[in-house]
Amino acid sequence: IRAEKAMVDGSWLDLAKRSKLEAQPFAHLTINATDIPSGSHKVSLSSWYHDRGWAKISNMTFSNGKLIVNQDGFYYLYANICFRHHETSGDLATEYLQLMVYVTKTSIKIPSSHTLMKGGSTKYWSGNSEFHFYSINVGGFFKLRSGEEISIEVSNPSLLDPDQDATYFGAFKVRDID
Amino acid sequence: IRAEKAMVDGSWLDLAKRSKLEAQPFAHLTINATDIPSGSHKVSLSSWYHDRGWAKISNMTFSNGKLIVNQDGFYYLYANICFRHHETSGDLATEYLQLMVYVTKTSIKIPSSHTLMKGGSTKYWSGNSEFHFYSINVGGFFKLRSGEEISIEVSNPSLLDPDQDATYFGAFKVRDID
Amino acid sequence: IRAEKAMVDGSWLDLAKRSKLEAQPFAHLTINATDIPSGSHKVSLSSWYHDRGWAKISNMTFSNGKLIVNQDGFYYLYANICFRHHETSGDLATEYLQLMVYVTKTSIKIPSSHTLMKGGSTKYWSGNSEFHFYSINVGGFFKLRSGEEISIEVSNPSLLDPDQDATYFGAFKVRDID
């Protein structure tokens, strides 16, 4: 029986370790600056890295600019979006800016999109300063179902900071749904 | 066999509970305001509390101003940095400020430092107002290896808010590396 | 013995799954805009949704405007607070604003309140722009005991954005206390 107990313990260690890893999807996606849309209106950002530098993904899928949930669960979602402008980039069309991010969830079954989180600020980026910068951070805990998609919308995408430490979003599973 | 099963269950509860606790390092470090550097340029903040008030640490190490990872894993890292100025503190050398935070990772094996997250804003803190305040929050999910070090760099450190609820950073392990 | 082992494994799967779910309280509370206080001074926000839209709660209690901890543990706490003003809402009493959030913990046993996290910014919302917006995000990792209460205080509550994606706070348990 002792050998059997050891076997039970051993198999359990494997099972617990395996199920724990399988049960924890995550993603950290960083902006792909080679394909940032222009304009000042709200647009969906579709180009993100998932496998270079700090970017990584596991048990989730990145497709068509969206982060797809493969496993039901409660997830912590976050986004960090940085905007910047240097006078050498040219004159701004307006000095009054609305710098915003929207983290949205789309359900395929019911083709509808809903904003989970938003953040940002109106800014006055006057010509008195040669450089302007502003960052937004949002985060929250949400129930996500397999097949649902997370995407990022921003205003003024041409002002995005293209660094991987500046503009990114991500998710990690915290627990199962009861 | 029932007694054996109960024993297995009991030992498993202990094992599961113990391994779960061992597997989840964390830290929440709050600014030590007795030793904030002066200057307006980017500096590394080396004085943090780890065992008073809200500050705490477990299965990680704080040494030489850096948070040292003791256990491989995926961690959620975060920082909250508050800057403030009251006219009674003296005159600002410039009203145009770049208030920034950089969360950096240093690897001992490959002596190099990389920025994981950055945030902040350019601000115009005019003399028309007697008090100014601004906070930055950043957070993200990163793979950290044992021996790697996390540190915080800020601009204008003399403007930091010294309260423990204002200026802090932390990390907690979410899952193992596959 | 094989049948017994299968039974052990089966009961363990149930037990592990059940205990894991029981061990992970969470809440995501969104602003109830039907009852936002007026004024510009710091006030405690007591009206939050816990069961509609993105709002949800499990193994925690929402009562009297406070999020009550039912289970000892280390929790990640977060808040996202959005302020906005449109000129059609009327003139601001002052264009110099202090837009702040304070996440506080109250212990019933020792009737005292302490600020865990704060964030915000001073803003100059001039009449030159018809619309103003600003969001704050804070987050951190804290030890919470059963019976302790989390509440949100803000300045200028009449400027709060009432959308569920804009003004919310939450918590989720990450690990037990050793």
Epitope: H86, S129, E130, F131 | S38, G39, S40, H41, S89, G90, D91, L92, A93, T94, E95, Y96, L97, Q98, S126, G127, N156, P157, S158, L159 | -
Partner: nanobody, 127 residues
Framework: EVQLVESGGGLVQPGGSLRLSCAAS????????MGWFRQAPGKGREFVGF????????YYADSVKGRFTISRDNAQNPLYLQMNSLRPEDTAVYYC????????????????????WGQGTLVTVSS
């Protein structure tokens, strides 16, 4: 890497005028507080003047007060030192530098309070 480049120096007769410029490249410093210093042959570096980032406050050494004026463009890089009523004792290499503190301290006239020095531009006042 930050670089400051001074220009505008030259030979001028006593009583004449010169306008020095200081341009920054690399990191943004157009809105940092800055200072002008000078070093005469065989002497130490001497404080000339200081200007805040907004240009709203200036300080001068007693030896140049009323004759020299520091200014800066609204948004562009250059920092200026307008020198009038020049004297032979103003002969020196003139340097601009970035003030390193967030607050204006009582030691703003000390060279140790400044970073990112330029190479300097020579001003010679002689008849």
């Amino acid at each position: 890497e930050v670089q400051l480049v001074e220009s505008g120096g030259g030979l001028v007769q006593p009583g004449g005028s010169l306008r020095l410029s200081c341009a920054a490249s690399g990191r943004t410093f157009s809105r940092s507080a800055m200072g002008w210093f000078r070093q005469a042959p065989g002497k130490g570096r001497e404080f000339v003047g200081f200007i805040t980032g907004s240009g709203g406050t200036t300080y001068y050494a007693d030896s140049v007060k009323g004759r020299f004026t520091i200014s800066r463009d609204n948004a562009q890089n250059p920092l200026y030192l307008q020198m009038n009523s020049l004297r032979p004792e103003d002969t020196a290499v003139y340097y601009c530098a970035v003030y390193r503190r967030t607050y204006i301290s009582s030691t703003y006239s000390e060279s140790s309070e400044y970073d990112y020095w330029g190479q300097g531009t020579l001003v010679t006042v002689s008849s």
